[in-house]
């Protein structure tokens, strides 16, 4: 008789999840020699231990602490780039601007990027059929709690000027319910962070509006100011040209506004 299995509303664990996490860990240490001390088998064991045999709606930050400890990494605190709803461009930027880091440029972020995972209470099985959806099922699921934990730690580590890339094509350029809006903004440390600088990325070729005047940006400014952190905002009218100018800053066309 097949065992009854909880049906969740979200997609199941990414196929080859254990193999992918382990492979990513080894790849990360290969391309970041300063992280070669990391034992990837121990990292996988700690990752697995955070959610295996646990109810996937009852995961806590505490569950991830062994993994957080193994993945401890020092990134330059003044070179942090946060992003919201514009991951690809943020990653293209840090690929060119090698001294800046998104969360996914750190070991733990790299391990979990674009993956889904969950287990089942009281069995050592990984659930490849379905996992809890944040809205429809529960917020304390393995994936959401992981990103909340690493995002909080990443924001807490930031100092000086922190940059955030925001998607100007969305109805809510700043969304209080995003990871940036609900976690990172509230965990920037005012005693360390002087300024949050928002880069609003325009989508349309002919879009010349000043999106820094958008009501949601004003809302972000208000939240940040109340936390005793300065706020500044820049429009990035031409993201393609922006990246090109990061690559080749001496190009003559890079003096004009981008």
């Amino acid at each position: 008789v097949p065992r009854w299995r909880q049906q969740w509303s979200g997609p199941g664990t990414t196929k080859r999840f254990p193999e992918t996490v382990l492979a990513r860990c080894v790849k990360y240490t290969e391309i970041h020699p300063e992280m070669r001390h990391v034992d990837c088998q121990s990292v996988w064991d700690a990752f697995k231990g955070a959610f295996i045999s646990k109810h996937p709606c009852n995961i806590t930050e505490e569950d991830y602490q062994p993994l957080m400890k193994l993945g401890t990494q020092t990134v330059p605190c003044n070179k942090i780039l946060l992003w919201s709803r514009i991951k690809d461009l943020a990653h293209q930027f840090t690929q060119v601007q090698r001294d800046m880091f998104t969360l996914e440029d750190t070991l733990l972020g790299y391990l979990a990027d674009d993956l889904t995972w969950c287990g089942e209470f009281n069995t050592s099985k990984i659930n490849y059929q379905s996992c809890p959806d944040w809205r429809k099922d529960c917020s304390n699921n393995p994936v959401s709690v992981f990103w909340k934990t690493v995002s909080r730690r990443f924001a807490e580590a930031a100092c000086d000027v922190v940059h955030v890339m925001l998607n100007g094509s969305r109805s809510k350029i700043f969304d209080k319910n995003s990871t940036f809006g609900s976690v990172e903004v509230h965990n920037l440390q005012p005693e360390k962070v002087q300024t949050l600088e928002a880069w609003v990325i325009h989508g349309g070729r002919e879009d010349s509006r000043d999106l820094c005047q958008d009501p949601t940006i004003k809302e972000l400014e208000s939240i940040i100011s109340k936390r005793n952190i300065q706020f500044s905002c820049k429009n990035i009218y031409r993201p393609d040209k922006f990246l090109q100018c990061v690559k080749n800053p001496e190009d003559s066309s890079c003096t004009s506004e981008i």
């Epitope: 193999e19 290969e30 990653h91």
Partner: antibody, heavy 120, light 107 residues
């Protein structure tokens, strides 16, 4: 079994570009960093750069920074190395290579090599 | 970039001889060193990784030692198929670098 199969020999004119391919089989392409190494006739091996096939992220040796581009096609499990503004000193055997994850970060697997000849 | 200096650049030896090739790094590379064998017209073959670990399928007459800046590849009893060029490589940090090679010839 694990194989890296490279494209055939190329003869190129000075100032032109060459694009060498490396088709991977027998393993999950995105699980391993792919490196490119070259060897001029009678010379030592020279590391050129790497690509993470999963994300397309790259890093290059400073010497080649302005002239080399490493890309990949995930659907074809193939990595590419393009070298531009060719000069006679670029005449060499070009290899793709990867580690085994169990052998430190030494290159346990190599393509058969692609000879690129640059003539004026 | 880390420089690797191999010595000798060439050597002649006979079948059955014990042969030692050295590789010196310009800075500490811990044990992040590999040794390769290359025959004419062929791709290099990994012999030793992490300075002293034997790669799969490599005969036990090959051994590696050393850490830090000084490393050695030893072939305990030369066989006819061992006549080739040998390279050391550091993977401690980027850019990865190789030694200039040691050509092992039949005496």
């Amino acid at each position: 079994q694990m194989q890296l199969v490279q494209s055939g020999a190329e003869v190129k004119k000075t100032g032109s570009s060459v694009k060498v391919s490396c088709k991977a089989s027998g393993y999950t392409f995105t699980d391993y960093i792919m490196h490119w190494v070259r060897q001029a006739p009678g010379q030592a091996l020279e590391w050129m750069g790497w690509i993470d096939p999963e994300y397309g992220r790259t890093d290059y040796a400073q010497k080649f920074q302005d002239r080399v581009t490493i890309t990949r096609d995930r659907s074809m499990s193939t990595a590419y190395m393009e070298l531009s503004s060719l000069r006679s000193e670029d005449t060499a055997m070009y290899y793709c290579a990867r580690s085994a994850h169990t052998t430190g970060f030494g290159f346990a697997y190599w393509g058969q090599g692609t000879l690129v000849t640059v003539s004026s | 970039a880390i420089q690797l200096t191999q010595s000798p650049s060439s050597l002649s030896a006979s079948v059955g001889d014990r042969v030692t090739i050295t590789c010196r790094a310009s800075e500490d590379i811990y044990s992040n060193l590999a040794w390769y064998q290359q025959k004419p017209g062929k791709a290099p073959k990994l012999l030793i990784y992490d300075a002293n670990s034997l790669a799969d399928g490599v005969p036990s007459r090959f051994s590696g030692s050393g850490s830090g800046t000084d490393f050695t590849l030893t072939i305990s009893s030369l066989q006819p198929e061992d006549f080739a060029t040998y390279y050391c490589q550091q993977y401690n940090n980027y850019p990865y670098t190789f030694g200039q090679g040691t050509k092992l010839e039949i005496k």
